[in-house]
């Protein structure tokens, strides 16, 4: 059976697969997924290993028409480094010389300057090039190699291993060499995999059942540390409760060096955030932190300094803390917009069972703003999801130069932000450099400001506008309002009408359905339309909604189904990657973000068309 990293190298024109007959004879044969000699896998960014021989594909020299054979894997050798060139060409790195079969009656695979069909290779059974099954470095735990990555294949007691092994052990713990020759270098670490006993790598907090892994002997950059946690279905540590900080202070008290945690300000336009998307509501900075020096965008916990936090450059090499297990944030359920008949008094706007109102003209200090909202039967607004925030920005008449009080504050417990309406803090969206909580100005209250409506802490005594929110009152059967310029069942936003397609459809089917409605799969022109769409679909239970974006026509170039330029993107992390496909919007915790899916997957979708009676603005000229 093929494991997910293994593949057969297939030439479509010959309809044959590469076959390692022996280390000195790499040829082709009829494809057979059970033949070990046809299985290959990437063992570094640029090396391809034969699974049968645990040797790497290479050449004797970077010259035209030399045989490709198998060599002992050497990550430093220039003659073993391969790369995918445009589309399905496979070539030796840095040269226009390609992996080729079929010329001059040659039985062997050759390195050749020709880039025709016989130099084009795919993963057998797919339309993907070889790089789509690329190498993912596996960061080790414990051992003696400071958390370095596994080196596959590695030699132990004169035997080669292409995977983690329990050789030399009687307890089943899996390990790997971190250089290709363990026997000489004696460097190794344990693999971040599930095996009997691997739970002892974690400390479980008996109070919350959350588990923590302290990797104090590792030396990784912040991004490497995060990857290591993710390889164990975990994330870099987030701390949202005072109890959690206390537990970790105890857990790390015997250590002295800094440890990476998930706090960062890597997002270009927003402020401090946790990598696991937990709300940033508890602050425990070291005095003098966070320093405003550019580049210091990642945060370490300092065991030697009472486990307080310090921002550093992300490329520094430190130990790190991973966290996994049930988070307390899931217990607060926000009703989906479609579940709640929402009736509001005049001048209040409905959304997901609540009513909202911006008071822009009567400026008030935070305390007085709160009193006014409470007199009106509500509270200063709490915001629990990106969808709710995007509703406020896109549909309440929020303006880019607004600065408005919301209900978040740390008046009760310093450095621990809470909502004034008592609902749990499940989401935060701070402005770049926020929360700054400058001590010389007690900044205990929070405003929404700027074009994106992100948040900043502020002294509570400033007179500002504010946003109130109250529970809506149900009034018998809901009346479906037909929005001016849109048919029944369509929702209007600016110049367009939108409709959710409720049948699970492939991308092509969804596109056809929209066309049948004299509409098209939605385009997304800017941040504000994205905000509207996020609030429109983001709280729904389905995972994905098709948009009109895909790279079906030209692989690697994403285009809308209608002739409109792609001027705005909202990719999820690791997207679009190298995968070709069609683009759908996520819901839930990653609400609104774009993922590339296989176009024949089934999802719901959003159709869009010009509202009736709207004058089309002229197309922008460039």
């Amino acid at each position: 059976l093929l494991d997910t990293r293994q593949f057969l190298i297939y030439n479509e024109d010959h309809k044959r697969c590469v076959d390692a007959v022996s280390p000195s004879a790499v040829q082709t044969a009829a494809c057979n997924q059970d033949a070990e000699s046809q299985k290959f896998r990437w063992v570094s960014e640029s090396q391809i290993m034969s699974v049968a021989f645990k040797l790497c594909l290479g050449v004797p020299s970077k010259t035209d028409w030399v045989a490709i054979t198998l060599y002992a894997c050497d990550s430093k050798s220039e003659f073993q480094k391969w790369e995918c060139k445009n589309d399905t060409l496979l070539g030796i790195k840095g040269e226009d010389l390609f992996f080729n079969y079929g010329n001059r009656q040659e039985k062997n695979i050759m390195l050749y300057k020709g880039s025709g069909l016989w130099s084009r290779w795919k993963i057998y059974g797919t339309t993907d090039n070889l790089c789509s099954r690329g190498y993912e470095a596996m960061y080790t735990l414990l051992g003696n190699a400071n958390g370095a990555t596994c080196a596959f294949p590695f030699k132990f007691e004169n035997k080669w291993y292409a995977d983690c092994t329990s050789a030399g052990r009687s307890d089943g713990w899996l390990w790997c060499g971190t250089t290709t020759d363990y026997d000489t270098d004696k460097l190794f670490g344990y693999c971040p995999l599930k095996f009997e006993g691997s739970e002892s790598l974690w400390n479980k907090d008996p109070l919350t059942s959350v588990s923590y892994q302290i990797n104090s002997k590792s030396a990784l950059t912040w991004h490497q540390a995060r990857k290591s946690c993710q390889q164990q279905n975990a994330e870099l540590l987030s701390i949202t409760e005072i109890h959690e900080q206390t537990y970790l202070t105890g857990l790390t008290s015997s250590l002295t060096s800094g440890l990476w945690i998930g706090l960062n300000s890597l997002s270009f336009n927003s402020g401090w955030q946790w990598s696991d998307r937990s709300p940033f509501r508890y602050l425990n900075w070291l005095p003098g932190s966070p320093s405003a020096e550019p580049g210091k965008s990642c945060v370490s916990l300092n065991p030697g300094k009472n486990a307080k936090w310090e921002n550093l450059e992300c490329v520094q090499k430190l130990g790190y803390i991973c966290k996994k297990g049930n988070t307390t944030l899931n217990s607060f359920v926000i009703p989906s917009e479609s579940d709640v008949p929402t009736h509001c008094p005049s001048q209040w706007w409905p959304y997901a069972g609540h009513c909202y109102k911006i008071h822009r003209d009567e400026k008030k200090i935070q305390r007085d703003a709160l009193t006014t909202c409470r007199k009106e039967g509500g509270d200063l607004t709490s915001i629990h999801t990106i969808e709710e925030l995007d509703f406020i920005i896109s549909q309440l008449g929020y303006e880019p130069n607004d600065e408005l009080w919301i209900g978040l504050n740390d008046i009760k417990i310093q450095m621990y932000f809470e909502w004034s309406d008592g609902t749990p803090v499940t989401f935060t969206k701070w402005l770049r450099g926020e929360p700054s909580h400058e001590n010389n100005r007690q900044e205990d209250c929070v405003v929404m400001k700027g074009k994106d409506g992100y948040w900043a802490d502020r002294g509570c005594e400033w007179p500002l506008g504010y946003i109130c929110k109250m529970k809506s009152r149900s009034q018998g059967p809901e009346i479906v309002e037909v929005e001016k310029g849109c048919r029944k069942g369509w929702k209007k936003h600016h110049f367009y009408c939108y409709m959710i397609g409720h049948t699970l459809s492939t991308f092509a089917e969804a596109n056809q359905t929209c066309n049948n409605e004299n509409a098209y799969l939605t385009t997304i022109e800017d941040r504000y339309e994205q905000a509207f769409l996020t609030s429109f679909v983001g709280l729904r239970p389905e995972k994905y909604f098709w948009t009109g974006l895909s790279d079906i026509q030209t692989k690697g170039t994403f285009q809308w189904t209608i002739e409109e330029e792609v001027r705005f993107t909202h990719w999820n992390s690791d997207m679009p990657g190298r995968k070709p496909g069609c683009v759908a919007m996520r819901t839930g915790i990653a609400g609104g973000l774009w993922d590339v899916l296989k176009c024949d997957e089934k999802a719901k979708f959003v159709c869009k068309h010009w509202a009736e009676g709207v004058t089309h603005p002229p197309k922008p000229t460039t």
């Epitope: 414990l142 051992g143 003696n144 030399g168 052990r169 713990w173 190794f188 344990y190």
Partner: nanobody, 110 residues
């Protein structure tokens, strides 16, 4: 160590060094001219296992804080005469897991 038949003896074994965790500890014995055999073992969670020949007479226990394993031997018989070895299955700074004590001779004789 010389013990009378029917007598008792307690063996102890401590593991030291750069140890992350001890997954299991156990006692083995080798009588003259015979193969080494497992007598008793205990996991990090406290589960125990005994050879049939010592069940009800020997008790293995462990002090995790001290990385130490004990073997309490009661109702000793002449056939218990052997060199007793302790083994620790550890996670440490080499990939090898099994570390052995140097052995202690127990003689049961009147």
């Amino acid at each position: 160590q010389l013990v009378q038949p029917g007598g008792s003896l307690r063996l102890s074994c401590a593991a030291s060094g750069s140890i992350f965790t001890i997954n299991a500890m156990g006692w083995y014995r080798q009588a003259p001219g015979k193969q080494r055999e497992e007598v008793a073992a205990i996991t990090s969670g406290g589960s125990t296992n005994y050879a049939d020949s010592v069940k009800g007479r020997f008790t293995i226990s462990r002090d995790n804080a001290k990385n130490t394993v004990y073997l309490q031997m009661n109702s000793l018989k002449p056939e218990d005469t052997a060199v007793y070895y302790c083994k620790a299955v550890v996670v440490t700074t080499t990939p090898y897991s099994d570390y052995w004590g140097q052995g202690t001779l127990v003689t049961v004789s009147s």
